[in-house]
Every structure is written in structure tokens, then in C-alpha cells.
Amino acid sequence: IPVIEPSVPELVVKPGATVTLRCVGNGSVEWDGPPSPHWTLYSDGSSSILSTNNATFQNTGTYRCTEPGDPLGGSAAIHLYVKDPAHSWNLLAQEVTVVEGQEAVLPCLITDPALKDSVSLMREGGRQVLRKTVYFFSPWRGFIIRKAKVLDSNTYVCKTMVNGRESTSTGIWLKVNRVHPEPPQIKLEPSKLVRIRGEAAQIVCSATNAEVGFNVILKRGDTKLEIPLNSDFQDNYYKKVRALSLNAVDFQDAGIYSCVASNDVGTRTATMNFQVVES
């Protein structure tokens, strides 16, 4: 198992400081850490040195050392804080994509461990995080949403108090995908329709999906009908509706109607027969 020097789990330095991290193993060792500036890497057989003579808040993060040849796959880690009063947050990513049910890590890292007790998470625009969202804060990792739901998809900002002043990170866009994405669910109502010529009629084609990126159309035979689209969001689902309203039906309105909904995954179709009779 590799060993890191300095032999502490956490290291706190000021901006501009010189930082040297050394990893020693039995065989060759490798470093992994946040993508950040100014590091130089020097490897010499079984040891590897990461160093900077100008630490910045962007160097804040966990540096892990592994020994690729180690059958046990052991690793060692050290977390570096570069305590910069002008930069309370170091964002390791601005977009995070997970599948629902997974842990979602919003990687905003505090640059000063003393800030950990005053952190909070908000949705962009100053809105509170949804009440049902279960999350916690880890100084080494950021905010962690325990079991992400599709509904948690949003832009989040991390906040903390520095000397009585609020310090806010830039936004992190969280996208939570369905475990098994599927074509939209559709409904075509009524399932069949018979009208006397001159009567009113309504045919409603609706589709729902967890993702907003889908389309729904209503066709008579092979002809796509130009009908306004109504959109809504309820019970964690996006709903899109095209409703054909006829004040006085005629024989040319009769035929096979198809409701077609599609997204990147596929298409679903429902059909119904509309008959128009003389009397």
C-alpha cells in the first residue's frame, strides 16, 4: 500500500505557498487529483513527487496515490485546502449527470475547513432545495444528494458565510436520468368515436415523460394535423397535449387517427377510428 508524505489526512496552506506531496510505494506509483494549475510531477522508481511553489484555491482537493502493480489495489489520499478568503469554493465540475437512485455529487469544495459549519445548498435563483431531496455536505467531496430523483435535475449553487458575508459558488447543473429511459407514454381519447354530421367532437392526444425532450403529433391517415401544443409539468412528469376540437364534423373528418410520441429512445403510437354518419 503506498504511503503519502506529509503523513496527515489534511493539509491547509495559504495561497502562494510551496506544497510538496510525495508518494512512496513498493513499485511504481501514480497520482490522481483535481485538474488544477501549477503542479509539477517528478517520478523516480517507487516514489513520485507532486509539487507547486504557487498554490492557488484551484489546487484544493483530494490527491490520491495508487500503486498500479499492487494486487490489493490499495491507495492513499491527502486532502489539500488552499485557504483563500477571496475564493471560498473550488468547483471541480459545472455539469454532473447521474442515473436516478444514484448518489449525486455536486463537487463544490470549500477552500477552508473552518467554513464547513456554515455551508448551504440552494437551487439557482435563490430557491430552496426541494423538501424531499435528501443531501449532506462532505468537506472533501462537496454536497451529496443521497438518492437522486429525476425531479432533482436543476442548477445548484453552494453557499457559505465568510466573515459574516455570503460567498456563493457558480452554478452546477445536475442532470438526473431515468434508469431505463423509454419512449413517452401516450393516451389517445376517446378510443373510438361515432358522430352525426354537424355535431361537435374532440380528440385528445397526450404524452408524458420524465424528460422534457420529446414530441407528440396527431395524424389523420398520413396527414400531420397542425394543432397547438400544450405543455405542463406535474407529478414529476412532463406532459404534452394536442387536442383536436371540431365544432361541426363532416365526412372528410372521418378516418383513422394516430397519436405519435417520440424521443431519443423510440416512438409510441396509438390509433382510433372516427366515424361520421348522416343521421
Epitope: I1, V3, S7, P9, A17, A76, A77
Partner: antibody, heavy 118, light 107 residues
Framework: EVKLEESGGGLVQPGGSMKLSCAAS????????MDWVRQSPEMGLEWVAE??????????FYAESVKGRFTISRDDSKSSVYLQMNSLRPEDTGIYYC?????????WGQGTTLTVSS | DIQMTQSPASLSVSVGETVTITCRAS??????LAWYQQKQGKSPQLLVH???NLADGVPSRFSGSGSGTQYSLKINSLQSEDFGSYYC?????????FGGGTKLEIK
Amino acid sequence: EVKLEESGGGLVQPGGSMKLSCAASGFTFSDAWMDWVRQSPEMGLEWVAEIRSKANNHATFYAESVKGRFTISRDDSKSSVYLQMNSLRPEDTGIYYCTRVKVGFDNWGQGTTLTVSS
Amino acid sequence: DIQMTQSPASLSVSVGETVTITCRASENIYSNLAWYQQKQGKSPQLLVHAATNLADGVPSRFSGSGSGTQYSLKINSLQSEDFGSYYCQHFWGTPRTFGGGTKLEIK
């Protein structure tokens, strides 16, 4: 509030054994690196042993003077760290402190006294 | 093993004075040095980590400096509560050796 409380010290004859315990509270014990440090008028402060967290494979390290005689262990379910001391010598006499390592030895217990004497 | 040599071993000073304690490592410890204060009958307390960073709650009259093998702890305008013993310790690998200590006494 971080609290570390040592117990198990006392008088023991040379060649004897003793087990020290340290009960921790006020922090996530399973994530912590824990050490034992001892102090005597002759040797001053002397680092004895360290056990790291599960994330660091519970790696253990010892001072040369106690290697092969002392064993550090932990029970994360009880938030406790232990020091099993065998083949004790008079020079092992001193106050034994349990400490938590973060950026340094951030927190110390009040200490427990071990006397090795015939 | 890295040896830590601390000086002076003892110091007799008056309240309000400024004192400097030094610590020399037998090899480069890359600023991985901590300073501790210990009052009579009490456990040591962390004062400074990573050579220059004050631990939480430590008054600003304390300051740490140094790099490579040479380090120092400075206490400006000594207060009565500052009297006691001070120790340096390196964190560049194990064993984590301490300096021999400096006893600060009231003149």
C-alpha cells in the same frame, strides 16, 4: 465537541503486559487517523503508534522503540482505539495520550499514566 | 529518522516581551511542521500547523515561519497565559519526531 478519553494505565512489572483504551466522541471516528503519544521527563514527547482510517486500509505505523512489542488497533463500531503493550520495559513509563490526526495532532485526551517498575 | 532540534531549552521572560523559539530538522521537511503548547499538568494543544497556519482559536500574537529545515515560532507581547512548554514536531513521514521542548518561564 471532540472528546478523547484514555483508560487502562497503572503499575506493571517489567516484562508484563497492559492494554490502553481510548474512547472518542464528537467526530466521525471511522474517518479519523488515531495516534498514541507518550511523555516522560527523560524522553519528552515521543510518538508511539498510528492507525489510519478504513479508507487508508487501517494502515499502522510504530516508533522503532516499540515495534514488535506494541500493537495499535481500533473498533470503529465502538469509536475506540487501543494500544496493546507487551514485554514492557522501565523506559516505557510515562503518560500515554490518545490523539486525533487531522492537520496535526489536533485533539488530545487527558492522558493515562503507565508505570513499569518492579 | 528525522531529528528535530529545538532551542532554547528554556527561556525566562517578562509579560509584554516578544520571544522566538526555533526548531531545526535534520533534513528538508517541506514546511510540514506543527507547534504545540503545553501548560503544567495539561495535555499539549495544537498552535500552528503546516509551519505558518494558526490552529482554530489561537490568538494572532502567535506566528509560525520557516521552510526547508529551519522553522520558528514567534510570540508577540507575551501574556501570562502563554507561559508553559512549547514543542515542535514534523509530519514528513513516520516516525513523527518532536523537538526536545522549550520551557517558557516568567521572569
